[in-house]
Interface confidence: low
């Protein structure tokens, strides 16, 4: 009943709670003297389903048979309509449509930790749409039973609040869950288990790692576990990896030696526990321990290259370059590089520690045989030194690689190809391809890049430190014992026409011809490798086509003579520059009048 129902009653048969698909009879009847005031036959009783009229009848009572009610709750309300007045609510009723509970499935119980309590879960099956009571029963040895109820419509979990103890770990316990509502009841199949089956240990805690003598090869992982734990699983991985290494250990008693860790690497460690070899379940993984392994002395050898520059008749400048060791080779933080320079015949040697750089420059006499050794040092020791004899890398003409070419290969890559030297190609021990940004004036501060290539290779793809629209000076060295030959070429990964032409800074007269001097185009405006300069000239105030002279680009050249100008004629001159992609705009214009005699 949904209100006081002072004026009448609504009855529902067979019940307020019905099985889905059933029919109900709803009767609305007025109490004596509760009809319309003047004339009772004018009583009009109306039955509403929620707020929609479904039936009406004149008189003291109304019968209605209702079918097809949906799952859930439906509200019926009976109202009285009298002439010249609003409808009056008489009474109402809620009808609950549902189904009997299905048999609960997959009943499983667990006790989290040796001190935890037994809790069970199950699958309810389809929703009953009715108030359903679940009773969970646990029976154990010595006729002990425990019972817990839950009256939640969605109940699928109950905690007994009792703790199973390991006194008799093989004793059997049986759990069963029963669901009951107004339309029926159903029980799960019994689930039988022992202490060892259902206790899921707590994850290990207080995880620590120790490195004996600060060595990665003597590493022990420690943790704490509940008392009955028999098995542990360890998993660990470098922090930047997605793949775990797994180890299973028995009777570890809270410690395990790890033998395969890499030095100077941050690792993540987790541990899980189990009480029995084949019974029960694994604990959750522990919290992660993150720890960095100690350093070990570097392995591997530095890749060292060098450059020689003539200073004067007695001195030369040597610039050494080397590449960082990989993380796996450095095995720690590299604190410094040790460079040793030695004159081989006289035995003089100097050693220097370099920090913060991967290059070193010094001046040595042009006489004598010189060698260098470079090694990397961390807190545990040094790498094996890389030894190089300083030689004239381009001295042996017969060792010079032939037909060197450099072609753009996609974004920011250059493919360098060559042919083996004329001299017996089998004499070549390795090729070195070297590249650096082309700077007029040969700036020695420009970073040097190189890669080594096996003697049977005749190409190399260079991609490190390659930028678009920049011209690179590329050299290919063929090395054989203490001899070397080289060839060079200019190359770029991407080019377009230069943004500006050269700036003519002077025109001077020399014996009936002129010498034009210009400033180089700024590197950032060259837009790749320059192939040619063009010098244009025409008579001032003339509409004729200008004449031109095309000069192959050479890095160091910034002047050129022209001897085809007529004396005492004023000319306008300008210059452009060309890459493979096209010609620049004009540089500045200069006027000049040759003063010399006519031919």
């Amino acid at each position: 009943k949904i209100d006081a129902c002072k004026r009448g009653d609504v009855t529902v048969k067979p019940s307020h709670v019905i099985l889905l698909g059933s029919t109900v009879n709803i009767t609305c009847s007025l109490k004596p003297r509760q009809g319309c005031f003047h004339y009772s036959r004018r009583n009009k009783l109306i039955l509403y389903k929620f707020d929609r009229r479904i039936n009406f009848h004149h008189g003291h009572s109304l019968n209605s048979q209702v079918t097809g009610l949906p799952l859930g709750t439906t509200l019926f309300v009976c109202k009285l309509a009298c002439i010249n007045s609003d409808e009056i609510q008489i009474c109402g009723a809620e009808i609950f449509v549902g189904v009997a509970p299905e048999q609960p499935q997959n009943l499983s119980c667990i006790q989290k930790g040796e001190q935890g309590t037994v809790a069970c879960t199950w699958e309810r099956g389809r929703d009953t749409h009715l108030y359903t009571e679940y009773t969970l029963q646990l029976s154990g040895p010595k006729n002990l039973t425990w019972q817990k109820q839950c009256k939640d419509i969605y109940c699928d979990y109950l905690d007994f609040g009792i703790n199973l103890t390991p006194e008799s770990p093989e004793s059997n316990f049986t759990a069963k869950v029963t669901a009951v509502n107004s339309l029926g009841s159903s029980s799960s199949l019994p689930s039988t288990f022992t202490f060892l089956d259902i206790v899921r240990p707590l994850p290990p805690w207080d995880i620590r790692i120790k490195f004996q003598k600060a060595s990665v090869s003597r590493c022990t992982l420690y943790w704490r576990d509940e008392g009955l734990v028999l098995l542990n699983r360890l998993r660990y991985r470098p922090s930047n990896s997605r793949l775990w290494n797994m180890v299973n250990v028995t009777k570890a008693k809270g410690r395990h030696d790890l033998l395969d860790l890499k030095p100077f690497t941050e690792y993540e460690f987790q541990i899980s526990s189990k009480l029995h070899l084949y019974k029960g379940s694994w604990s959750d993984w522990s919290e992660s321990l993150r720890a960095q392994t100690p350093e070990e002395e570097p392995t591997g050898m530095l890749d060292v290259w060098y450059m020689k520059r003539h200073i004067d008749y007695s001195r030369q400048q040597i610039s050494l370059f080397w590449k960082n060791l990989s993380v796996s080779e450095a095995r720690g933080k590299i604190l410094h590089y040790q460079v040793t320079l030695q004159e081989l015949t006289g035995g003089k040697a100097m050693t220097q520690n370099i920090t913060g750089h991967t290059s070193w420059t010094t001046v040595i006499p042009r006489t004598g045989n010189w060698a260098v050794a470079v090694s990397a040092a961390n807190s545990k020791g040094s790498s094996l030194p890389t030894r190089i004899n300083i030689m004239n890398l381009c001295e042996a003409g017969l060792l010079a690689p032939r037909q060197v070419s450099a072609n753009s290969e996609g974004m920011d890559n250059i493919l360098v190809t060559w042919q083996p030297p004329r001299k017996d190609p089998s004499a070549v021990q390795e090729y070195v391809v070297e590249w650096r940004e082309l700077h007029p004036g040969g700036d020695t501060q420009v970073p040097l890049n190189w890669l080594r290539s096996r003697p049977y290779n005749v190409s190399a793809l260079i991609s490190e430190n390659i930028k678009s629209y920049i011209c690179y000076e590329i050299r290919v060295y063929a090395l054989s014992g203490d001899q070397g030959g080289c060839s060079s070429i200019l190359g770029n990964s991407k080019h377009k026409a230069p943004l500006s032409g050269p700036h003519i800074n002077a025109i001077t007269e020399e014996k009936g011809s002129i010498l034009i001097s210009w400033n180089s185009i700024p590197v950032q405006e060259q837009m790749g490798c320059l192939l040619h300069y063009r010098i244009y000239w025409k008579e001032r105030d003339s509409n004729s086509q200008p004449q031109l002279c095309e000069i192959p680009y050479r890095v160091s050249q910034n002047s050129h003579p022209i001897n085809s100008l007529q004396p005492r004629v004023t000319y306008v001159l300008w210059m452009t520059a060309l890459t493979a992609a096209g010609e620049s705009s004009h540089g500045n214009e200069r006027e000049f009048c040759l003063q010399g005699k006519a031919n």
Epitope: W205, D206, R208, E287, R290
Partner: nanobody
Framework: EVQLVESGGRLVQAGDSLRLSCAAS????????MGWFRQAPGKEREFVSA???????????YYADSVKGRFSISGDYAKNTVYLQMNSLKAEDTAVYYC?????????????????WGQGTQVTVSS
């Protein structure tokens, strides 16, 4: 490196309540712990309370005997924030309260086990 910022400290009367917050930013992990320590003038820093996150849930809380039953630690993993609810405050609770975080798992109340520290927030309880 985890950065920690405490807030909520102020002057209160004995018997009052106060809630401190500690927000963590930077490199945070799915498994680590956060705790509160305090240092009264002229005294050593002492442990107050700590909790452990495990995969986003708090699976363990721990209190110093002197605050048990009066202080409560909680956290919001989504916000990387830990709170210290302090009830029935006493004059002896006056101190600078520091938030600390650790990715190591050792003794909870040992300040050497914590790798990151906040600047501290002053709590003064007047009687």
């Amino acid at each position: 490196e985890v950065q920690l910022v405490e807030s909520g400290g102020r002057l209160v009367q004995a018997g009052d309540s106060l809630r401190l917050s500690c927000a963590a930013s930077g490199r945070t992990f799915t498994s680590y712990r956060m705790g509160w320590f305090r240092q009264a003038p002229g005294k050593e820093r002492e442990f107050v309370s700590a909790l452990r996150w495990s995969s986003g849930n708090i699976d363990y809380t721990y209190y110093a005997d002197s605050v048990k039953g009066r202080f409560s630690i909680s956290g919001d993993y989504a916000k990387n924030t830990v709170y210290l609810q302090m009830n029935s405050l006493k004059a002896e609770d006056t101190a600078v309260y520091y938030c600390a975080a650790s990715t190591r798992w050792g003794v909870m109340e040992s300040d050497t086990e914590y790798t990151s520290w906040g600047q501290g927030t002053q709590v003064t309880v007047s009687s």
